[in-house]
């Protein structure tokens, strides 16, 4: 069971300092941006991190949304990352959900975060280069020190 708590506005970056944004095709991508680029591209660079209470504590449970024309929420259905046009629900009556990730700091580095899927144990949000694009993907990872699954989250509230 997950019960919705408070939300915060955040900018998410990979460890190469590229900024996560949602492009016109609703794809989550990373790109080099100055602070002014980041502001100019809002709200596509501003993510709503919705925190949830977890009936079996496993870290901070979050859903990640973005509000452009409508609210879209990050999903890892079938292990594929996409933004679905939906509001994060107030309650989820299950211990797993495609929109819930566990946000945890990397041990010894409170400013570096990992996001593990609640649906797929051992699968993490990751940044991966595909041709000329840096994409947000879900990746099965057994190298937990790999920088591709680490992010910084800057609160904008």
């Amino acid at each position: 069971y997950f019960g919705k708590l408070e939300s915060k506005l955040s900018i998410i970056r990979n460890l190469n300092d590229q900024v996560l944004f949602i492009d016109q095709g609703n794809r989550p991508l990373f790109e080099d941006m100055t602070d002014s680029d980041c502001r100019d591209n809002a709200p596509r660079t501003i993510f709503i991190i919705n925190m949830y209470k977890d009936s079996q504590p496993r870290g901070m449970a979050v859903a990640i949304s973005v509000k452009c024309e409508k609210i879209s929420t990050l999903s890892c259905e079938n292990r594929i990352i996409s933004f679905k046009e939906m509001n994060p629900p107030d309650n989820i009556k299950d211990t797993k959900s495609d929109i819930i990730f566990f946000q945890r700091s990397v041990p010894g580095h409170d400013n570096k975060m990992q996001f593990e899927s609640s649906s797929y144990e051992g699968y993490f949000l990751a940044c991966e280069k595909e041709r000329d694009l840096y994409k947000l993907i879900l990746k099965k990872k057994d190298e937990l020190g790999d920088r591709s699954i680490m992010f910084t989250v800057q609160n904008e509230d």
Partner: antibody, heavy 126, light 107 residues
Framework: QVQLVQSGAEVKKPGASVKVSCKVS????????FHWVRRRPGKGLEWMGR????????KYAERFKDRVTMTEDTSTDTAYMELSSLRSEDTAVYYC???????????????????WGQGTLVTVSS | DIQMTQSPSSVSASVGDRVTITCLAS??????LTWYQQKPGKAPKLLIY???KLQDGVPSRFSGSGSGTDFTLTISSLQPEDFATYYC?????????FGQGTKLEIK
């Protein structure tokens, strides 16, 4: 309690190949990997590589990548490690081990080698 | 590759002694470090994971500490069954690498 049972000792000639098996018995959760580690006489532990039973993807240590093949048969819950072009320096005890997630009190994951096979002595001698 | 430098390579001690073994990583491995004990003719046994978390069933005289690049395994009061070889292992990135091992012998 998971147990790993390995095949018996082998004596091989230089240039030959050896295939060691590792059978899982007991209840094992999903999301684990098989790793292979060896210990040569008078030396320390040495990581050789791993296989993911979910998709058969492998990662090998650079020094073995041209000679080692790791496979897994999900139907029999058995992992295999084949080492080719054997030389005397490959004389060692070879271990299979499971690599899976343990968690701390906040749910943070750590991979560990928890269950180990009993080891298989491979002797390479002409 | 990440190098793990373990020291000392051997140590002689008596029952009741406090023994410390160190492992130094060549780069930041966070706390993705495990410690193993191996006795002759036996498979390694997990003692500590996450640098400082005691595996179930392991006596509390064993403890681990450290983060980043410097790690320590401490046995607070040696017991006869503790004489063995100890290894650290970094699990941060492939290839996984072990320390060279520390042989703990009876003085």
């Amino acid at each position: 309690q998971v147990q790993l049972v390995q095949s018996g000792a082998e004596v091989k000639k230089p240039g030959a190949s050896v295939k060691v098996s590792c059978k899982v018995s007991g209840e094992i959760s999903t999301g684990y990997y098989f790793h292979w580690v060896r210990r040569r006489p008078g030396k320390g532990l040495e990581w050789m590589g791993r296989i993911d039973p979910e998709d058969d993807s492998t990662k090998y240590a650079e020094r073995f990548k041209d000679r080692v093949t790791m496979t897994e048969d999900t139907s029999t819950d058995t992992a295999y490690m084949e080492l080719s072009s054997l030389r005397s320096e490959d004389t060692a005890v070879y271990y299979c081990t499971t690599w899976r997630i343990y968690r701390d009190s906040s749910g943070r994951p750590f991979y560990v080698m928890d269950a180990w096979g009993q080891g298989t002595l491979v002797t390479v001698s002409s | 590759d990440i190098q793990m430098t373990q020291s000392p390579s051997s140590v002689s001690a008596s029952v009741g002694d406090r023994v410390t073994i160190t492992c130094l990583a060549s780069e930041d491995i966070y706390t993705y470090l495990t410690w193993y004990q191996q006795k002759p003719g036996k498979a390694p046994k997990l003692l500590i994971y996450g640098a400082n978390k005691l595996q179930d069933g392991v006596p509390s005289r064993f403890s681990g500490s450290g983060s980043g690049t410097d790690f320590t395994l401490t046995i607070s009061s040696l017991q006869p069954e503790d004489f063995a070889t100890y290894y650290c292992l970094q699990g941060s990135k492939f290839p996984l690498t072990f320390g060279q091992g520390t042989k703990l012998e009876i003085k």
